[in-house]
Amino acid sequence: AITEAREEAKPYPLFPGPFPGSLQTDHTPLLSLPHASGYQPALMFSPTQPGRPHTGNVAIPQVTSVESKPLPPLAFKHTVGHIILSEHKGVKFNCSISVPNIYQDTTISWWKDGKELLGAHHAITQFYPDDEVTAIIASFSITSVQRSDNGSYICKMKINNEEIVSDPIYIEVQGLPHFTKQPESMNVTRNTAFNLTCQAVGPPEPVNIFWVQNSSRVNEQPEKSPSVLTVPGLTEMAVFSCEAHNDKGLTVSKGVQINIKAIPSPPTEVSIRNSTAHSILISWVPGFDGYSPFRNCSIQVKEADPLSNGSVMIFNTSALPHLYQIKQLQALANYSIGVSCMNEIGWSAVSPWILASTTEGAPSVAPLNVTVFLNESSDNVDIRWMKPPTKQQDGELVGYRISHVWQSAGISKELLEEVGQNGSRARISVQVHNATCTVRIAAVTRGGVGPFSDPVKIFIPAHGWVDYAPSSTPAPGNADPVLII
């Protein structure tokens, strides 16, 4: 039979007969030696006759008295085996044993679930000596029990190298259900089923679960814990909780919000971080992600020139770091830029469009049709060219840079000339006779110096030569033209 004491048990004398009596005054269950009279308080039962030593772990002392009678076996007396009480109540229980006075230094230790209880526990051992035996009563009290106090408690005593162990006292702390698993917030796809889990434990068991959605009960009858709720799908955000019921009452889980994944909101605050002739660095602030992580973003770029054909360039990039360098743009051009981002559901609308401009760049092509003449009468070299196409000037021409290299008998000298943007010819004076002059020309804007044209070489003879002819930029493929005059 399970021996149990419930918290309603009334205080009663601790020790009848020869032991000093004490009354329990704290309204907590008090378990003690059975009464010699055989009387036991209500709701406290022992599995064997009161006062009889139990047959468990006993020590049979070898010492004999003067009359050489062997001493009776030593054993803890029976006490109540099972205590059921509510959380935060107090409890006191004890072990008792009568030990012949011939034994010295007997100590009782308390153990819970196989581990010795040391330190900060309210364990008191009292000794009541008589002529031949000493009654030892070890009391253990807990002022405010918690669930962690649940378990099996025993007393141990070492005597004569023998260990005496009491019967266990089972403490069962009952309370409201305690959640071991509560539903968790989730982001779910619209109209798609998903599961929520709720688990709670006693004691006392059983624990029954009710599910609540937006304050309406989902199941009108309880389900045994643990319970899994299959939600058949949602079209809008909902709040779920579960109620756990047992004989002590009800505990309600935290309410969790289940959000419906949606397309993101458009990005905001698209701004220009940096502009160059052919690129624009933009940043943006992502909009609300629609309860689903951003996957990537799309930058849309339109020429803002009303005469342009209105085509849109699209650049895809990762969602982080909310920064993108748009490349391959024309210099000195106006663009409208918008950003859109996507999650697993779809693309956001495009952000508000912003206007951005590229700066002037260095020209992207060299002047064309470069021609070089020797004007012997004035001892000059005349250079002519055609300006690069306007589209490829990448800015407003401010002039040209002419490189002329003079090579003669192991001597090489490079000179640079800057000329204004008006016109397409220049005259440079001959630096060295009997030498080769190599001419290259680059267009210049405020954005910088463009590429130099292919070199055009002209031979400058010694004084007195009469014939001369122009030297010009060759047809593509002739990399190193030389014209000897």
Partner: antibody, heavy 118, light 106 residues
Framework: QIQLVQSGSELKKPGASVKVSCKAS????????MNWVRQAPGQGLEWMGW????????TYADDFKGRFVFSLDTSVSTAYLQISSLKAEDTAVYFC???????????WGQGTLVTVSS | EIVLTQSPDFQSVTPKEKVTITCRAS?????MHWYQQKPDQSPKPWIK???NLASGVPSRFSGSGSGTDFTLTINSLEAEDAATYYC?????????FGQGTKLEIK
């Protein structure tokens, strides 16, 4: 498989009482509540209420408070609907149906026709 | 209590036609269930929680909606679909049914 089998048709005089039974099989009777639904001739469905098969507690829709009583005998997995002081307007088919999550009536009895006529 | 109004009350339809039955609630509900009933039979569960077809229901049926407006749609009507369809709300007690929509095959 899950089945709800209802008792047969009844012909009653006004003022009499009738008790309709609904025997469940194929599942644990106390796991699901039992609803009662009325359908008057040529009319739509009306929810009368339900009984908690776990606690035995009945819940009645407003129009069905008073003369209508839901009861159980869990030992034979049976729910009952008793109507007292029968009136001609009680003539209808009465259905029992299991009460699932979200008040989904997944299983229905075949219906019991109660005719009240003098 | 929440009043459910179905429309139309009655519809005569030719096979292969698309049919839409609507159920409007007097205030917002969480889910709408649909049941099919044929003469002298008990109602059959048809669509659970707005959009989930019950076991054995043909895929030509679908359900949708939220808040106060819900629909049952039959993509291509077949003769066996002739029946009365009822909506039933979950979310507010007492539970209520719509008055029913009777579909007849021309």
């Amino acid at each position: 498989q899950i089945q709800l089998v209802q008792s047969g048709s009844e012909l009653k005089k006004p003022g009499a009482s009738v008790k309709v039974s609904c025997k469940a099989s194929g599942y644990t009777f106390t796991n699901y509540g039992m609803n009662w639904v009325r359908q008057a001739p040529g009319q739509g469905l009306e929810w009368m209420g339900w009984i908690n098969t776990y606690t035995g507690e009945p819940t009645y829709a407003d129009d069905f408070k008073g003369r209508f009583v839901f009861s159980l005998d869990t030992s034979v997995s049976t729910a009952y609907l008793q109507i007292s002081s029968l009136k001609a307007e009680d003539t209808a088919v009465y259905f029992c149906a299991t009460y699932g999550h979200y008040a989904w009536f997944a299983y229905w009895g075949q219906g019991t026709l109660v005719t009240v006529s003098s | 209590e929440i009043v459910l109004t179905q429309s139309p009350d009655f519809q005569s339809v030719t096979p292969k036609e698309k049919v839409t039955i609507t159920c409007r609630a007097s205030s917002s509900v969480s889910y709408m269930h649909w049941y099919q009933q044929k003469p002298d039979q008990s109602p059959k569960p048809w669509i659970k929680a707005t959009s989930n077809l019950a076991s054995g229901v043909p895929s030509r049926f679908s359900g949708s909606g939220s808040g106060t407006d819900f629909t049952l749609t039959i993509n291509s009507l077949e003769a066996e679909d002739a029946a009365t369809y009822y909506c039933q709300q979950w979310g507010t007690k007492p539970l209520t049914f719509g008055q029913g929509t009777k579909l007849e095959i021309k």
